[in-house]
C-alpha cells in the first residue's frame, strides 16, 4: 500500500508522527471519531519526551487523549499496552469519581492544566489531539 511521507497541512510533525491540536471542544467519542475520519487517532503518549511535546502545544487546558476504560480495563485506542506503557496520572488518579452528579463514573483520560492526567466524564467538551504515524502503510490498494 501507499505510505504517508509528510504531514497534512495544519498538522505538526514530531518524531515521525503528525499531530493536530484542536482549539475547541468535543466529547471524547466525538473527538475520537473526528480523528478516525482524518485517518488518525486520539493521541497515544508513549514516552516522557512525547508527553512534554504535547504539553508544550496544548498549554494549561483540559485536553482529551486516546486512553479510556469504558469497557473495563484502561486501553489506548491504537492497542498500545497500557500496563507496561508510559503513565503520567495526577496523584490519586484515576479515581472513577461518581460525585459529579452527571451519572456514572469517569472513563476517559485527559491532560490537565499541568499536563498530568486525570479521568473524567467522557461527555465533557474538551479540546483534543489527533495523531497519525508517518510511513504507516495506508489502506489504499497499491497502484498498478
Amino acid at each position: 500500500g501507499s505510505e504517508r511521507t509528510c504531514c497534512p497541512v495544519n498538522w505538526v510533525e514530531h518524531e515521525r508522527s503528525c499531530y493536530w491540536f484542536s482549539r475547541s471542544g468535543k466529547a471524547w467519542a466525538d473527538a475520537d471519531n473526528y480523528c478516525r475520519l482524518e485517518d488518525a487517532h486520539l493521541v497515544v503518549v508513549t514516552s516522557w519526551e512525547e508527553q512534554k511535546f504535547v504539553q508544550h502545544h496544548i498549554g494549561p487546558v483540559n485536553t482529551w487523549m486516546g486512553l479510556h476504560d469504558q469497557n473495563g480495563p484502561w486501553k489506548w485506542v491504537d492497542g498500545t499496552d497500557y500496563e507496561t506503557g508510559f503513565k503520567n496520572w495526577r496523584p490519586e488518579q484515576p479515581d472513577d469519581w461518581y460525585g459529579h452528579g452527571l451519572g456514572g463514573g469517569e472513563d476517559c483520560a485527559h491532560f490537565t492544566d499541568d499536563g498530568r492526567w486525570n479521568d473524567d466524564v467522557c461527555q465533557r467538551p474538551y479540546r483534543w489531539v489527533c495523531e497519525t504515524e508517518l510511513d504507516k502503510a495506508s489502506q489504499e490498494p497499491p497502484l498498478l
Partner: antibody, heavy 121, light 107 residues
Framework: EVQLLESGGGLVQPGGSLRLSCAAS????????MSWVRQAPGKGLDWVSV????????FYADSVKGRFTISRDNSKSTLYLQMNSLRAEDTAVYYC??????????????WGQGTLVTVSS | DIQMTQSPSSVSASVGDRVTITCRAS??????LAWYQQKPGKAPKLLIY???SLQSGVPSRFSGSGSGTDFTLTISSLQPEDFATYYC?????????FGPGTKVDIK
C-alpha cells in the same frame, strides 16, 4: 476545478440492490473524507455515510446501517455506495460530497449534481 | 441523535431586505454548525461553517452567529440570487444531521 460526477441511479424494486459511483477530479482525492447525502423528492437533506481518505474508517446513519456500504478506490478517484435491501423510503437524489476538515469538524464543501434512485414495484 | 429545527419554515422577502433564519439543536453542539444554500434542481452549496466562518467565494452579506444550541444565519441585504432554501447542519456528532430547511421566496 473540482468536479464530482455521480452515476448508477435508476429504478429498482423493493429488496433490490444498486451501486452508485462518484468520479472525482480536480483535487487530491485520497486526502479527503467523502460522504453521501440524499434528498427525497420535495424533502430536506439527509446524511447517509462518510468514509476517511484512506477508506480505513466509515460511519453510517442508523437508517442505512447494515444495508449500505460506502467504499472508495483512490487509484481511480472514485467513491461508491453499495445499496442492498432497498426500501421505498430510500427513494431520493443521492449526492456525493467532499468532507473538508475545518477547525475540528467535517463540512461538505463540494457536491456532485446527484443521481436519482427510485425504489418502487 | 441530535435533532435540528429551523424557523421560520418559509419567509417572503424583497430585494434589499434583511433576512434572519434561526436554527436550534436538541443539545449543545459546541459550535460545530454549518449553513448551506440550495436552489431548485441544484446541489447544496456551503455558505458558512463553524458558526461564523464564511466559505471562500461567499458574499459578505451572509453571516452566522450563535452558540450552544441556538444559531442564526443573516442575509444583510437580500439579492435576487439569494432566493433559495437554506439548511443548517451539525457536525458535532455522528450521525450528522440537517435542519428541515427554510425557504426564502419573493414577496
Amino acid at each position: 476545478e473540482v468536479q464530482l460526477l455521480e452515476s448508477g441511479g435508476g429504478l429498482v424494486q423493493p429488496g433490490g440492490s444498486l451501486r452508485l459511483s462518484c468520479a472525482a477530479s480536480g483535487f487530491t482525492f485520497s486526502s479527503y473524507a467523502m460522504s453521501w447525502v440524499r434528498q427525497a423528492p420535495g424533502k430536506g437533506l439527509d446524511w447517509v455515510s462518510v468514509i476517511s481518505g484512506s477508506g480505513g474508517s466509515t460511519f453510517y446513519a442508523d437508517s442505512v446501517k447494515g444495508r449500505f456500504t460506502i467504499s472508495r478506490d483512490n487509484s481511480k478517484s472514485t467513491l461508491y455506495l453499495q445499496m442492498n435491501s432497498l426500501r421505498a423510503e430510500d427513494t431520493a437524489v443521492y449526492y456525493c460530497a467532499s468532507a473538508i476538515a475545518a477547525a475540528g469538524a467535517h463540512y461538505f464543501d463540494y457536491w456532485g449534481q446527484g443521481t436519482l434512485v427510485t425504489v418502487s414495484s | 441523535d441530535i435533532q435540528m429545527t429551523q424557523s421560520p419554515s418559509s419567509v417572503s422577502a424583497s430585494v434589499g431586505d434583511r433576512v434572519t433564519i434561526t436554527c436550534r439543536a436538541s443539545r449543545d453542539i459546541n459550535g460545530w454548525l454549518a449553513w448551506y444554500q440550495q436552489k431548485p434542481g441544484k446541489a447544496p452549496k456551503l455558505l458558512i461553517y463553524t458558526v461564523s466562518s464564511l466559505q471562500s467565494g461567499v458574499p459578505s452579506r451572509f453571516s452566522g452567529s450563535g452558540s450552544g444550541t441556538d444559531f442564526t444565519l443573516t442575509i444583510s441585504s437580500l439579492q435576487p440570487e439569494d432566493f433559495a432554501t437554506y439548511y443548517c447542519q451539525q457536525s458535532n456528532s455522528f450521525p450528522f444531521t440537517f435542519g428541515p430547511g427554510t425557504k426564502v421566496d419573493i414577496k
